[in-house]
């Protein structure tokens, strides 16, 4: 906190300049105008002041705004940002994406700070949903941006924003996160022929479903094994031996690597030895010949 | 972001000593850097600045026509030359920076003493 004093005779500011880096914290206090850097907040920018002086710049500007900042203010705050507090922030109304992006420059090359998700969760909420622009700005700062949403917050995504999303951006999104993106992305490449749909939906696959999943086995796609390792287990364990190897084509023998490992395991403990003997892979751990199995599910649902 | 600061040492009063101020991690081509400095006891006052392209410096009225501060871009490095050193010069002398978007870096300071 700066004490109040009169400032000094000549010093008042005109302008901001180069010339305040000059200035004590007290005659910042005193001698520049509030309304005055409120105005000139983009030259601010350009001075190499301290971190001591530029708090004093943040406390004028608090106290000129005490219900929250404008945006043409927000918008040129620069290192500023990084100063304010999540409460201070969600006083904000900030509806332009140059905004937030001007913000997340700032902040680049470090992790999302208390700040940044708090300026994100304004402009997300005060624009409605997370439009392609908006995502695209938002994955491009931050890959892990998407996987950070609950499934709730995903589901405000709208269809045509998939085209945004890389597949980087989904490395750390978990099944139910996928379960709701898969829905959507299957909507937004509905048009694409089938080659380039994979392409597109690949990364999303670890939401389909079993229908999904045999319709492509249809389609030549040769899904490789770390696609299909994250596959949901649910979606993968109705699939016959057969299907799964019209998925993986020349992939399938990738599956002897994985035979310990989910879904492969359970998806392995669900078929006929015999026809997991015709892959030729010497996968083991198949329901041996002669044995019947009961789909006690399919019973209940008879009665 | 961190700013180093070297060149500093003691020195006896009309003597000179240059001071640099480089990047750790990033460059500072673009980037506006303001010397400033610290005596003991004292608040930390503003000695000059240079703009990013060197065009435009500038200086506080009490070391106007001694120190002269320039950009060596081959160095990437901000160097602040001090002459006719006085004993009231005598302090912890600091760089700060401000680059695109208004990214801010500080350095730890160097010591210079005129006795």
């Known amino acids: 906190e700066v004490e109040k004093t009169a400032c000094p005779s000549g010093k008042k500011a005109r302008e901001i300049d180069e010339s305040l880096i000059f200035y004590k914290k007290w005659e910042l206090e005193a001698c520049v105008d509030a309304a005055l850097l409120a105005t000139q907040m983009d030259r601010v920018n350009a001075i190499p002041f301290t971190y001591e002086q530029l708090d004093v710049l943040k406390h004028k500007l608090d106290e000129l705004y005490p219900q929250g900042y404008p945006e043409s203010v927000i918008q040129h705050l620069g290192y500023l940002f990084l100063k304010m507090s999540p409460e201070d922030i969600r006083k904000w109304n900030v509806t332009s994406l140059e905004t937030l992006k001007a913000l997340l420059e700032v902040n680049k090359g470090h992790e999302m700070s208390p700040q940044v998700a708090t300026l994100i969760d304004r402009f997300v909420k005060g624009r409605g949903q997370l439009d392609k622009d908006t995502l695209d700005t938002l994955t491009a700062f931050y890959p892990g941006y998407l996987c950070s949403l609950s499934p709730e917050e995903l589901s405000s995504v709208p269809p045509s924003s998939i085209w945004a999303v890389r597949p980087q951006d989904l490395d750390t999104c978990d099944p139910r996160q996928l379960d709701v993106l898969y829905p959507k992305a299957r909507l937004a490449f509905q048009n694409m022929n089938g080659s380039e749909y994979f392409v597109k939906i690949q990364s999303f696959l670890g939401g389909a479903p079993t229908e999904d999943l045999k319709a492509l086995s249809q389609q030549n796609v040769s899904m490789d094994l770390a696609t299909f390792m994250k596959l949901r287990t649910d979606a993968v364990l109705p699939l016959t031996v057969a299907e799964v190897q019209k998925l993986l084509g020349p992939h399938v023998e990738g599956l002897k690597a994985e035979e310990r490992h989910r879904p492969v395991r359970d998806w392995i403990l669900r078929q006929r030895q015999d026809d997991l003997d015709t892959l030729g892979l010497g996968l083991q751990g198949g329901i041996p010949n002669g044995y019947l199995v009961l789909d006690l599910s399919m019973q209940e649902a008879l009665s | 972001l961190q700013l180093v600061e070297s060149g500093g040492g003691l020195v006896q009063p009309g003597g000179s000593l240059r001071l640099s101020c480089a990047a750790s991690g990033f460059t500072l081509d673009n980037y506006a850097i303001g010397w400033f400095r610290q005596a003991p006891g004292k608040e930390r006052e503003g000695v000059s600045s240079?703009?990013?392209?060197?065009?435009?410096?500038n200086y506080a009225d009490s070391v106007k026509g001694r120190f002269t501060v320039s950009r060596d871009n081959a160095k990437h490095t901000v160097c602040l030359q001090m002459n006719s050193l006085k004993p009231e010069d005598t302090a912890v002398y600091y760089c700060?920076?401000?680059?695109?978007?208004?990214?801010?870096?500080m350095g730890q300071g160097t010591s210079v003493t005129v006795s």
């Open positions: 240079i703009s990013s392209s060197g065009g435009s410096t």
């Open positions: 700060a920076g401000v680059g695109d978007y208004g990214r801010r870096a």
